[in-house]
Interface confidence: low
Amino acid sequence: FKVATPYSLYVCPEGQNVTLTCRLLGPVDKGHDVTFYKTWYRSSRGEVQTCSERRPIRNLTFQDLHLHHGGHQAANTSHDLAQRHGLESASDHHGNFSITMRNLTLLDSGLYCCLVVEIRHHHSEHRVHGAMELQVQTGKDAPSNCVVYPSSSQDSENITAA
């Protein structure tokens, strides 16, 4: 399977909400012994390998934001911890999974990574990630709503195998 990032750049005004999205592509094994661990974290540019750093999103680390379920099942994060930080990660039946960030501030600007780990018999078998950038703007030049920029076809399937 692969992870696609429909948009590589999100430009949003301060105070707005944004939903960053990744999509699971390709054949997904629905066997009883196969589950998927999906999560989000921040990273930094200028690395040899994109998404190699695992930084918290608003003090929530990648395991705080994770979803753990079978194939294309729907799921979302526990509401208490994440929602206190204005965050919610979710997954639908179609392979889409996302993180919603509420009331954006300039500090939210940066590189965000989605991570999917396929787990068989409790062992990590395959891992892929996708990356996208969020720019939060303020002042007269800021857009009134979030503007999204589609990924190039090359970028939209950002694959990193274990």
Epitope: Y37, S44, E47, R54, Q63, V117, S124, A162
Partner: antibody, heavy 123, light 107 residues
Framework: QVTLKECGPGILQPSQTLSLTCSFS??????????VSWIRQPSGKGLEWLAH???????RYNPSLKSRLTISKDSSSNQVFLKITSVDTADTATYYC???????????????WGQGTTLTVSS | DIVMTQSPSSLSASLGDTVTITCHAS??????LSWYQQKPGNIPKLLIY???NLHAGVPSRFSGSGSGTGFTLTISSLQPEDIATYYC?????????FGGGTKLEIK
């Protein structure tokens, strides 16, 4: 109670491969956020981070040694391994394994260390 | 790589003194900085994490401060058991790097 213990050959000749084992208890490397690093310290000198392995088998290496390092794990037996190929006298050091937890609000530090295993590379 | 520079490399102080050790990062490491104490013949022991948080069981005379590129470890009312080498370590980015160490001795 969290404990880690390193095991190594003690003495190697130049060009041989070093195989180290870190056996741990008190935590599971299958748990989200857990990770184990290898760190070394030549006698009387400072600490040098070598490699890290995450719970999900993601791995990180020190670029200065990356071509010679391989880190791996066996979560079911609570062990982490490190191989260093083509050792030289400069690899003479005490090798530590240490737990690094990426946890809520206070991640990215080594909270538990093994006692260390000493390697001497000599012809 | 982020280079961590500690100063001084060694210092001598009297019992009861307040001792300050500094650590400078070549790049911004936010607050992802830890301090470790290594007594002669022993393993490193975590003292401070996230720049200023005292690890469980560490005496309150140890404190840490700073963010970005400049950090300080302070030991107030120096005790005989504080004789050790102290290391800072950044966790901002790989490769993880340590300072060269500060060897603390009693006058």
């Amino acid at each position: 109670q969290v404990t880690l213990k390193e095991c190594g050959p003690g003495i190697l000749q130049p060009s041989q491969t070093l195989s180290l084992t870190c056996s741990f208890s008190g935590f599971s490397l299958s748990t989200s956020g857990m990770g184990v690093s290898w760190i070394r310290q030549p006698s009387g000198k400072g600490l040098e981070w070598l490699a890290h392995i995450y719970w999900d088998d993601d791995k990180r290496y020190n670029p200065s040694l990356k071509s010679r390092l391989t880190i791996s794990k066996d979560s079911s037996s609570n062990q982490v391994f490190l191989k260093i190929t083509s050792v030289d006298t400069a690899d003479t050091a005490t090798y530590y394994c240490a737990r690094r937890l990426d946890g809520y609000n206070d991640p990215y530090y080594f909270d538990y260390w093994g006692q260390g295993t000493t390697l001497t590379v000599s012809s | 790589d982020i280079v961590m520079t500690q100063s001084p490399s060694s210092l001598s102080a009297s019992l009861g003194d307040t001792v300050t050790i500094t650590c400078h990062a070549s790049q911004n490491v936010n607050v992802w900085l830890s301090w470790y104490q290594q007594k002669p013949g022993n393993i490193p022991k975590l003292l401070i994490y996230k720049a200023s948080n005292l690890h469980a069981g560490v005496p309150s005379r140890f404190s840490g401060s700073g963010s970005g590129t400049g950090f300080t470890l302070t030991i107030s009312s120096l005790q005989p058991e504080d004789i050790a080498t102290y290391y800072c370590q950044q966790g901002q980015s790989y490769p993880l790097t340590f300072g060269g160490g500060t060897k603390l001795e009693i006058k």
